[in-house]
């Protein structure tokens, strides 16, 4: 099939005081390569600093996947996901509050 | 090749503004940020700050906070640091640096000059 | 602001000798999530800097295996096993984990 662009979502949820966990997740995308990890200043986090969902698919053709990790609130601004797929990459910033969610589809 | 290629010396007086050049080649220029570093003559190093230039984000040292502005220009693979209000104390060299996979700065420019003197 | 405080400021050697170099963060650089980012750089004259290892204890490509860092916390140690002629410079220890990054005050690794 053809390649299909990843849709990637980063939200975030307390952790423990003055701790947040960020989540970010990319779905509908094909084919199943993708990189997706959590960058701090631009530079990747170590793997066992960060949580990993397996490459699924999700029941359209296409699959999804997330990574998590937790980092100290207030410093949202220094954290971004860093996607790759197919040849095209994308960062995408920590949403400011609670309320907000941000998506963005990659072409 | 991996390369940082940064803009000559100036000689600029004080209270003058001045900017520096990062011209980055052989990788996806909005791949990486682009961190600057001072270093005055015979001393350590200093982190000024970093801008991301997929979205133009930037992170800076307070010290630095209003004297030092970061730009990019993505048509030219092009980083700038823009120093203003200029004294002696920024006589220095002004290193631009890229970082890789899980490093921060892994590729660094040759460094530029500022002499600040009237 | 975290304070880098590398000793000694001055480390003369003998080639072939093994030289340890310390540096010690003013608090802890291990980040909510467990990262730690403290790396170690060489300036020789005229230079820039040169990046020898990354996170606390891995070497950078093409840096040679007498290099070693180790540590954690607040305390870290960088080792080169046996001095070459080429190691001589100005060693500095520089941690990412909380803004505003630092850098150590520089160790001159010299001949004795």
């Known amino acids: 099939g053809s390649t299909v662009p990843p849709m990637v979502n980063v939200t975030r949820s307390e952790a423990s005081e003055g701790n947040i966990t960020v989540t970010c997740r990319a779905s509908g995308f094909y084919p199943w390569n993708i990189t997706l990890s959590w960058r701090q200043d631009g530079v990747s986090l170590s793997h066992d600093t960060q949580q990993w969902g397996d490459v699924l698919p999700d029941g359209n053709g296409t699959y999804q996947t997330w990574v998590a990790t937790r980092i100290c609130q207030g410093e949202e601004q220094r954290f971004t996901c860093y996607m790759e797929h197919s040849g095209n990459h994308s960062t995408h910033p920590v949403p400011s509050g609670n309320s907000h969610h941000h998506h963005h589809h990659h072409h | 090749e991996i390369q940082l290629q940064q803009s000559g010396p100036e000689l600029v007086k004080p209270g003058a503004s001045v900017k520096v050049s990062c011209t980055a080649s052989?990788?996806?220029?909005?791949?990486?940020?682009i961190y600057w570093v001072k270093q005055s003559h015979g001393k350590s190093l200093e982190w000024i700050g970093y801008?991301?230039?997929?979205?133009?984000?930037?992170i800076s040292n307070q010290k630095f906070t209003g004297r030092a502005t970061l730009t990019v220009d993505k048509s030219s693979s092009t980083a700038y640091l823009h120093l203003n209000s200029l004294t002696s104390e920024d006589s220095a060299v002004y290193y631009c640096?890229?970082?890789?996979?899980?490093?921060?700065?892994?590729?660094w420019g040759a460094g530029t000059t500022v002499t600040v003197s009237s | 602001d975290i304070l880098m405080t590398q000793t000694p400021l001055s480390l003369p050697v003998s080639l072939g000798d093994q030289a340890s170099i310390s540096c010690r963060s003013s608090?802890?650089?291990?980040?909510?999530?467990?990262?730690?980012?403290l790396e170690w750089y060489l300036q020789k004259p005229g230079q820039s800097p040169k990046l020898l290892i990354y996170?606390?204890?891995n070497r950078f490509s093409g840096v040679p295996d007498r290099f070693s860092g180790s540590g954690s916390g607040t305390d870290f140690t960088l080792k080169i096993s046996r001095v070459e002629a080429e190691d001589l410079g100005v060693y500095y220890c520089?941690?990412?984990?909380?803004?505003?990054?630092?850098f150590g005050s520089g160790t001159k690794v010299e001949i004795k």
């Open positions: 640096a890229r970082p890789g996979s899980y490093w921060y700065f892994g590729v």
């Open positions: 052989g990788y996806a220029f909005t791949k990486y940020n």
């Open positions: 801008i991301d230039p997929y979205t133009g984000g930037t």
């Open positions: 608090q802890s650089i291990v980040y909510t999530n467990g990262n730690t980012n």
């Open positions: 996170k606390v204890s």
């Open positions: 520089f941690q990412a984990s909380y803004v505003p990054f630092t």
